[in-house]
Amino acid sequence: TQNKALPENVKYGIVLDAGSSHTSLYIYKWPAEKENDTGVVHQVEECRVKGPGISKFVQKVNEIGIYLTDCMERAREVIPRSQHQETPVYLGATAGMRLLRMESEELADRVLDVVERSLSNYPFDFQGARIITGQEEGAYGWITINYLLGKFSQKTRWFSIVPYETNNQETFGALDLGGASTQVTFVPQNQTIESPDNALQFRLYGKDYNVYTHSFLCYGKDQALWQKLAKDIQVASNEILRDPCFHPGYKKVVNVSDLYKTPCTKRFEMTLPFQQFEIQGIGNYQQCHQSILELFNTSYCPYSQCAFNGIFLPPLQGDFGAFSAFYFVMKFLNLTSEKVSQEKVTEMMKKFCAQPWEEIKTSYAGVKEKYLSEYCFSGTYILSLLLQGYHFTADSWEHIHFIGKIQGSDAGWTLGYMLNLTNMIPAEQPLSTPLSHSTYV
């Protein structure tokens, strides 16, 4: 007679990442009896919600349920029905919603209320929707990549199971770039963290970690572009903005009201003698880089050293995983290889930005023009942020690893968030039982 497979004893969890530009739903799976082991949780599905970020629904809150339907339905299909009721669902909103809350707490609450009501309609165990702090976003991203890289495991291995593994327990730093904010998180070397706001203490798997983190609101790639435009239009002599961060021949009309819609441009706001202006691309990397540097105030630092805008940053230490838009942008530009030096990246960016817009459109016909037009800025911004903002050098550039996935799971804050909320990262090292670990590799 045929052997019948025993039903898998597995658990599932769902996290929705409500970012500034879009929402993604992640489904995670793990063996029920190994909940406290490190590295057992893995992503089985990512469903990117088709549409903008939830903060864009502020005037159409009643439609948030429609917007979320397809991916929630996908979760119903992927997760066995018998598991639905015990599958936790968490939604974390990041900087797009932080900005909306700055503008109007009432509107942000209304969006979250509708999100909660919509998600409560599904057969899962909905655990709430909230705006996570920048500190949490940085911390959970750091936990995610180190969990997936096996850095919390106490067992030393003679073989490498994951890329980037240096076969030691030195954790990786985390560099996260979104549309509206960017996070830097790492364990400094024997350095006191001079600003309490940037200090985190964790005890994970029996080991203490003193972690530095900071989230720069308004320094995600989309908001940084708005900042740059608002800064540059101040000194434009008329309604034409010749912009080195866009390809030669590129033209786009921008409404001044759109430019000043975000709290991120408030510091540059002024009364302009026109309602619209036209961006005309001139495609010059060096000038674009110079313009971006003006967004970083490096003239003031109340600590031993700073990143920018008076924010403490300890000396960089160890390897870093750069993910989310750091990865997507560099992947598009074909610059994620470990072998590409910082000088080569700069060289490639110079060439890319100088390419005529018509040529670019022909080469990348399948990419929406709005996104395609911004890769020159985004690539230049990444270089500026990493080199001048965070003080990476040509030498330390090789310690940055542009990471999309690790072991099939997306690098980002969502896995760390779920691990924390489901209490799956114990403070102490779990005792090995003969059943849960084999004696031999």
């Epitope: 903008p52 349920g65 339907t69 990419v367 929406k368």
Partner: antibody, heavy 122, light 111 residues
Framework: EVQLQQSGAELVKPGASVKLSCIVS????????INWVKQRPEQGLEWIGR????????KYDPKFQGKATMTSDTSSNTAYLHLSSLTSDDSAVYYC???????????????WGQGTTLTVSS | DIVLTQSPASLAVSLGQRATISCRAS??????????MNWFQQKPGQPPKLLIY???NQGSGVPARFSGSGSGTDFSLNILPMEEVDAAMYFC?????????FGGGTKLEIK
């Protein structure tokens, strides 16, 4: 501007197969779902199915399962509908379409291809 | 499958007047607090065009004279005031469950 450009009219023999294409421009095909809809002369609309080009996931009307296969190629921003074992009942106009939210604003809009006329005749 | 029955099959309305088209589903098309009913317009030789989604929301660029209402199994599309360009076929469509289905259509003409 979002556009869906469908391949030209097809005249095929019964029993043969055909692959219709739908080239998307103005947005990334991965950022939407592509639906296929059949319309016979002077008749109503029939939904064949939908594909998510981001991951290849599909949903079909069971009556088109085995008859129709939807695929997509994200590198060329193109969706395809493959129809097999053709009979005169398959003679129709086939539309590709997207409807849903724009990826920048919360605007819900639709875009349709101009339709491909398929004639099955010996 | 969810069967959608449209009525009337054809309708003639004077310019400036109200046109009302009904659509009845064989079972509820509501789920998760949403009515998964859409309305499309089609003119001869053209592809359909989305007018209303989720029972009552206007598609982008759709004139305000088009409105939708209803929940559960009974839905209607209203056009007020009727204009010459509105003469067309109208189809209801449910996307609650696979297979998604369309109604048989209503031909709207000018009286």
């Amino acid at each position: 501007e979002v556009q869906l450009q469908q391949s030209g009219a097809e005249l095929v023999k019964p029993g043969a197969s055909v692959k219709l294409s739908c080239i998307v421009s103005g947005f990334n095909i991965k950022d939407t779902y592509i639906n296929w809809v059949k319309q016979r002369p002077e008749q109503g609309l029939e939904w064949i199915g939908r594909i998510d080009p981001a991951n290849g996931n599909t949903k079909y009307d069971p009556k088109f399962q085995g008859k129709a296969t939807m695929t997509s190629d994200t590198s060329s921003n193109t969706a395809y509908l493959h129809l097999s074992s053709l009979t005169s009942d398959d003679s129709a106009v086939y539309y590709c379409a997207r409807w849903g939210y724009d990826d920048e604003e919360a605007d819900y809009f639709d875009s349709w291809g101009q339709g491909t006329t398929l004639t099955v005749s010996s | 499958d969810i069967v959608l029955t449209q009525s009337p099959a054809s309708l003639a309305v004077s310019l400036g007047q109200r046109a009302t088209i009904s659509c009845r589903a064989s079972e509820s098309v509501d789920n998760y607090g949403i009515s998964f009913m859409n309305w499309f317009q089609q003119k001869p030789g053209q592809p359909p065009k989305l007018l209303i989604y989720a029972a009552s929301n206007q598609g982008s660029g759709v004139p305000a004279r088009f409105s939708g209402s209803g929940s559960g199994t009974d839905f209607s599309l209203n056009i007020l005031p009727m204009e010459e360009v509105d003469a067309a076929m109208y189809f209801c469509h449910q996307s609650k469950e696979v297979p998604w289905t369309f109604g048989g259509g209503t031909k709207l003409e000018i009286k």
